[in-house]
Interface confidence: low
């Protein structure tokens, strides 16, 4: 009943709680003298479903037949109506539609730890919708049992609180959990176990780690585990991989030695425990362990390659540039590389340790034969030396890699295409294709790039630092034995119509043409490789077409003579530049008269 | 630089199908990714389709969500010709259509990534 009901009642036939599908009849009766005053005809008795009129019957009682109420908890309410009055609430009932539960599935048990207590889980199948009571029972041996219940709705685990021990371990013990509620019953299938069946170890714990002699090929994990573990599984990663490295170990006591860890990397471990070989489940994993495994001296050699600049009749500046080793090769943190630069016919050699760099300029003389040697050192030793004679790297013409073309291809990067040199092309022992920014001015500080190709490929695809709307210079090295050729062309990833147009900082006049001088674009509004510049002219104050003169891009370009225009006749000139993707606007206009009449 | 021909665009009925082409000169579409941009009368122009050239096999479609299922774009190397079949076109479909290549890779939708454009070809579909 869910109120006093002081005023009349409400039963429900067969019950209160009924198997879903079933039909309830539900009466409304009021107690003697609680109808409408004066007259009991007029009583108007009211059943609602929740909030909504189901029935209405003139009199001192109602009855109601009810079918298909839906699973969970239905509220009628029973009221009275008399005339020029607000309804009066009799009486109330809950109705609990439901079903019997079903059959307990998956019944399993779990120890955890040699010290920790058994628990059971089960699937209680599909909701009852009802107040549903689990018994769970254990039977051991020497006719023992344990009984624990559980009333939450939601019942599908229980925990006995009861040790089972090691003294017999092949002992059976048997769970069954039985289901009770007011439409039925139904017990698990049993299951019966043993210790050894159930206990699943306490996951390792105090996980150590130990390199020998600071060498990762000695290298010994230590850990502690419960009393009675007999395999372990160990499981270990750097930590920036997602594939784990697994390995299975018998009667470790808690030390395992691993042979195939990387020098200076980061590792994570982690640890797994279990009884018995084939009985019971295995432990979690352990917390892991991290730790850095110990530097080794670097293998493989640097990457090295270097750019010769005249400076005078007799010195000349060499820059070397070498590529960092990869992590597996530097095996630690690099202190330092060291170049040795050698004049091999006298024998003079210096020898200099670079520190945060990956790049060394110095000017040596023009004359002698000249080497160089760069390694990389770390706390435990030196990288083999990369040794390269220094030579001119273009000066074999026949050599020179032939039909060198630069596309776009794709973002940010450049497909390099070349046809081998005309000279036997079974000489070619590599070629390398070298790129940097193209700064008008032929920055040397400019950073270099550069990849080495096998001679048999005649294309290399370059995206190492190609930034988009910038113009890169690419050169294209064929190498074999102490000769080389080259050849060079502009190439850009993506490009679009200059920004600007070049600045006209000067019109002279020269014996009847002029020469007009200009200042570059800057880089970063020349929005790719520049191909050629236009010089337009009109008359002052003409509306006719301008003439133009377009002259190829070159980098060290900024004057040109032009010898078509009328003396005594005042012209405007401008330029614009023009990339693949077309024309810049008009640079600044400047006005010019021959004949010295220059405004 | 490629320079485009669109073709094949006419009066048609609700629900019928139509074939645009693209033919391009200048020089082959390697490399190129080629893009259907349409623009109807008062209203910006908006990204269709686009297919991307890898050397001479097509390595990449994208279509713009409110004709994926009906549109269909492909082309044909030989011919250096990318085309855009439209099938259950609807009344919302008249539009100018252009198209667009460029030798970028970067944002398939955005006009101002390409850099050779079309005249465009007239498509009306009559209700």
């Known amino acids: 009943k869910i109120d006093a009901c002081k005023r009349g009642d409400v039963t429900v036939k067969p019950s209160h709680v009924i198997l879903l599908g079933s039909t309830v009849n539900i009466t409304c009766s009021l107690k003697p003298r609680q109808g409408c005053f004066h007259y009991s005809r007029r009583n108007k008795l009211i059943l609602y479903k929740f909030d909504r009129r189901i029935n209405f019957h003139h009199g001192h009682s109602l009855n109601s037949q009810v079918t298909g109420l839906p699973l969970g908890t239905t509220l009628f309410v029973c009221k009275l109506a008399c005339i020029n009055s607000d309804e009066i609430q009799i009486c109330g009932a809950e109705i609990f539609v439901g079903v019997a539960p079903e059959q307990p599935q998956n019944l399993s048990c779990i120890q955890k730890g040699e010290q920790g207590t058994v628990a059971c889980t089960w699937e209680r199948g599909r909701d009852t919708h009802l107040y549903t009571e689990y018994t769970l029972q254990l039977s051991g041996p020497k006719n023992l049992t344990w009984q624990k219940q559980c009333k939450d709705i939601y019942c599908d685990y229980l925990d006995f609180g009861i040790n089972l021990t090691p003294e017999s371990p092949e002992s059976n013990f048997t769970a069954k959990v039985t289901a009770v509620n007011s439409l039925g019953s139904s017990s698990s299938l049993p299951s019966t176990f043993t210790f050894l069946d159930i206990v699943r170890p306490l996951p390792p714990w105090d996980i150590r780690i130990k390199f020998q002699k600071a060498s990762v090929s000695r290298c010994t994990l230590y850990w502690r585990d419960e009393g009675l573990v007999l395999l372990n599984r160990l499981r270990y990663r750097p930590s920036n991989s997602r594939l784990w490295n697994m390995v299975n170990v018998t009667k470790a006591k808690g030390r395992h030695d691993l042979l195939d860890l990387k020098p200076f990397t980061e590792y994570e471990f982690q640890i797994s425990s279990k009884l018995h070989l084939y009985k019971g489940s295995w432990s979690d994993w352990s917390e892991s362990l991290r730790a850095q495994t110990p530097e080794e001296e670097p293998t493989g050699m640097l990457d090295v390659w270097y750019m010769k600049r005249h400076i005078d009749y007799s010195r000349q500046q060499i820059s070397l540039f070498w590529k960092n080793l990869s992590v597996s090769e530097a095996r630690g943190k690099i202190l330092h590389y060291q170049v040795t630069l050698q004049e091999l016919t006298g024998g003079k050699a210096m020898t200099q340790n670079i520190t945060g760099h990956t790049s060394w300029t110095t000017v040596i003389p023009r004359t002698g034969n000249w080497a160089v040697a760069v390694s990389a050192a770390n706390s435990k030793g030196s990288s083999l030396p990369t040794r390269i004679n220094i030579m001119n790297l273009c000066e074999a013409g026949l050599l020179a890699p032939r039909q060198v073309s630069a596309n776009s291809e794709g973002m940010d990067n450049i497909l390099v295409t070349w046809q081998p040199p005309r000279k036997d092309p079974s000489a070619v022992q590599e070629y390398v294709v070298e790129w940097r920014e193209l700064h008008p001015g032929g920055d040397t500080q400019v950073p270099l790039n550069w990849l080495r190709s096998r001679p048999y490929n005649v294309s290399a695809l370059i995206s190492e630092n190609i930034k988009s709307y910038i113009c890169y210079e690419i050169r294209v090295y064929a190498l074999s034995g102490d000769q080389g050729g080259c050849s060079s062309i502009l190439g850009n990833s993506k490009h679009k119509a200059p920004l600007s147009g070049p600045h006209i900082n000067a019109i002279t006049e020269e014996k009847g043409s002029i020469l007009i001088s200009w200042n570059s674009i800057p880089v970063q509004e020349q929005m790719g490789c520049l191909l050629h510049y236009r010089i337009y002219w009109k008359e002052r104050d003409s509306n006719s077409q301008p003439q133009l003169c377009e002259i190829p891009y070159r980098v060290s370009q900024n004057s040109h003579p032009i010898n078509s225009l009328q003396p005594r006749v005042t012209y405007v000139l401008w330029m614009t530049a023009l990339t693949a993707a077309g024309e810049s606007s008009h640079g600044n206009e400047r006005e010019f008269c021959l004949q010295g009449k220059a405004n | 630089e490629v320079q485009l021909v669109e073709s094949g665009g006419r009066l048609v009925q609700a629900g019928d199908s139509l074939r645009l082409s693209c033919a391009a000169s200048?020089?082959?579409?390697?490399?190129?990714?080629v893009g259907w941009f349409r623009q109807a009368p008062g209203k910006e122009r908006e990204f269709v389709s686009a297919?991307?050239?890898?050397?001479?096999?097509?390595?990449?479609?994208y279509y713009a969500d409110s004709v994926k299922g009906r549109f269909s774009i492909s082309g044909d190397y030989a011919k250096n010709t990318v085309y855009l079949q439209m099938n259950s076109l609807k009344a919302e479909d008249t539009a100018v259509y252009y198209c667009?290549?460029?030798?970028?890779?970067?944002?398939?939708?955005?006009?101002?990534?390409?850099?050779?454009w079309g005249q465009g070809t007239q498509v009306t579909v009559s209700s």
């Open positions: 200048g020089r082959t579409f390697t490399n190129y990714r």
């Open positions: 297919l991307r050239w890898s050397s001479s096999n097509i390595d990449y479609t």
């Open positions: 667009a290549a460029s030798t970028s890779w970067g944002v398939l939708e955005s006009d101002t990534e390409y850099t050779s």
